[in-house]
């Protein structure tokens, strides 16, 4: 059957932890991505931002997991109004910010 939302979120959090702790060289060669507003629709916005990073195996699983939280199909070059389009940050910082926010959502019971 389908994975419960709480389990899916916990697994996404654990995957982001694995990414941050296994960082030896700069994550995704220091690629920059658009910063996002960590609000409603955040999962799609995060996917839209990360999907523009190509050739980075370290975040491929994260991209797949985020797609499970986003109700619509996301493709490279697609951006929603949720992006703070004047700010780019390194993928590593993006992942750290996203991880902390998701841990707070988990605590608050916001699994979807």
């Amino acid at each position: 059957g389908p994975v419960p939302p709480s389990t899916a979120l916990r697994e996404l959090i654990e995957e982001l932890v694995n990414i941050t702790q296994n960082q030896k060289a700069p994550l995704c060669n220091g690629s920059m991505v658009w910063s996002i507003n960590l609000t409603a629709g955040m999962y799609c916005a995060a996917l839209e931002s990360l999907i523009n990073v190509s050739g980075c195996s370290a975040i491929e699983k994260t991209q797949r997991m985020l797609s499970g939280f986003c109700p619509h199909k996301v493709s490279a070059g697609q951006f929603s109004s949720l992006h703070v389009r004047d700010t780019k940050i390194e993928v590593a910082q993006f992942v750290k910010d996203l991880l902390l926010h998701l841990k707070k959502l988990f605590r608050e019971g916001q699994f979807n």
Epitope: I13, L100, K103, K104, F106, R107, E108, G109
Partner: antibody, heavy 122, light 108 residues
Framework: QMQLVESGGGVVQPGRSLRLSCAAS????????MHWVRQAPGKGLEWVAV????????HYADSVKGRFTITRDNSKNTLNLQMNSLRAEDTAVYYC???????????????WGQGTMVTVSS | SYILTQPPSVSVAPGETTRITCGGN??????VHWYQQKPGQAPVLVIY???DRPSRIPERFSGSNIGNTATLTIEDVEAGDEADYYC???????????FGGGTKLTVL
């Protein structure tokens, strides 16, 4: 100002019971999860129990489960800990602690009482 | 149940930077809080949610949490920072709040 004041500590014989109370003031008690934390002399902090803001959920440390009961009265802004079948290893300072309530009570303890000493000795 | 491991003691000279670690399996997936306790006093929250600082706590205190280790960093250490420091997490699997064993910080 916001404060938590514990009472009810004292010296008690092994196997006997004791009831601790905590009076809260200066904040909206009914909107917070409440915990008991204890500290044996010269030892570290040990979490004892939690009760949800509305009293709907309680959880206990394995070391006290089945012997201690945490309750609250939101109309009187009080938290209680009923301690039965006390053992020498329950000797400690007991702190009443406040934590903002979420779906999961994973919040930090942002307000502590000064503690009340419980000594279990024959 | 979930176990948090801290070094029993850490020593530092005034004005230096010290780091107190808190180890736990995939602790990076949990929100970590840190407390300072001085002799005869109740603990005081110094860092919450991995890296946030209560308004009354000096900027010299900071926190991080990556992988299997959370870290409390105190910069420009003062004599008044001498205390016991405890890390804490909520263990979702057991519904228990868990404290580390505590680290005694001595300012030389």
């Amino acid at each position: 100002q916001m404060q938590l004041v514990e009472s009810g500590g004292g010296v008690v014989q092994p196997g006997r019971s004791l009831r601790l109370s905590c009076a809260a003031s200066g904040f909206e008690f009914r909107t917070y999860g409440m915990h008991w934390v204890r500290q044996a002399p010269g030892k570290g902090l040990e979490w004892v129990a939690v009760i949800w803001d509305d009293g709907s959920n309680t959880h206990y440390a394995d070391s006290v489960k089945g012997r201690f009961t945490i309750t609250r009265d939101n109309s009187k802004n009080t938290l209680n800990l009923q301690m039965n079948s006390l053992r020498a290893e329950d000797t400690a300072v007991y702190y009443c602690v406040r934590a903002p309530q979420w779906y999961l009570t994973a919040e930090a303890f942002d307000l502590w009482g000064q503690g009340t000493m419980v000594t279990v000795s024959s | 149940s979930y176990i948090l491991t801290q070094p029993p003691s850490v020593s530092v000279a005034p004005g230096e930077t010290t780091r107190i670690t808190c180890g736990g399996n995939l602790i990076g997936a949990k929100l970590v809080h840190w407390y300072q306790q001085k002799p005869g006093q109740a603990p005081v929250l110094v860092i919450y949610d991995d890296s946030d600082r209560p308004s009354r706590i000096p900027e010299r205190f900071s926190g991080s949490n990556i992988g299997n280790t959370a870290t409390l960093t105190i910069e420009d250490v003062e004599a008044g920072d001498e205390a016991d420091y405890y890390c804490q997490v909520w263990d979702y699997s057991s519904n228990h709040m868990v404290f580390g064993g505590g680290t005694k910080l001595t300012v030389l």
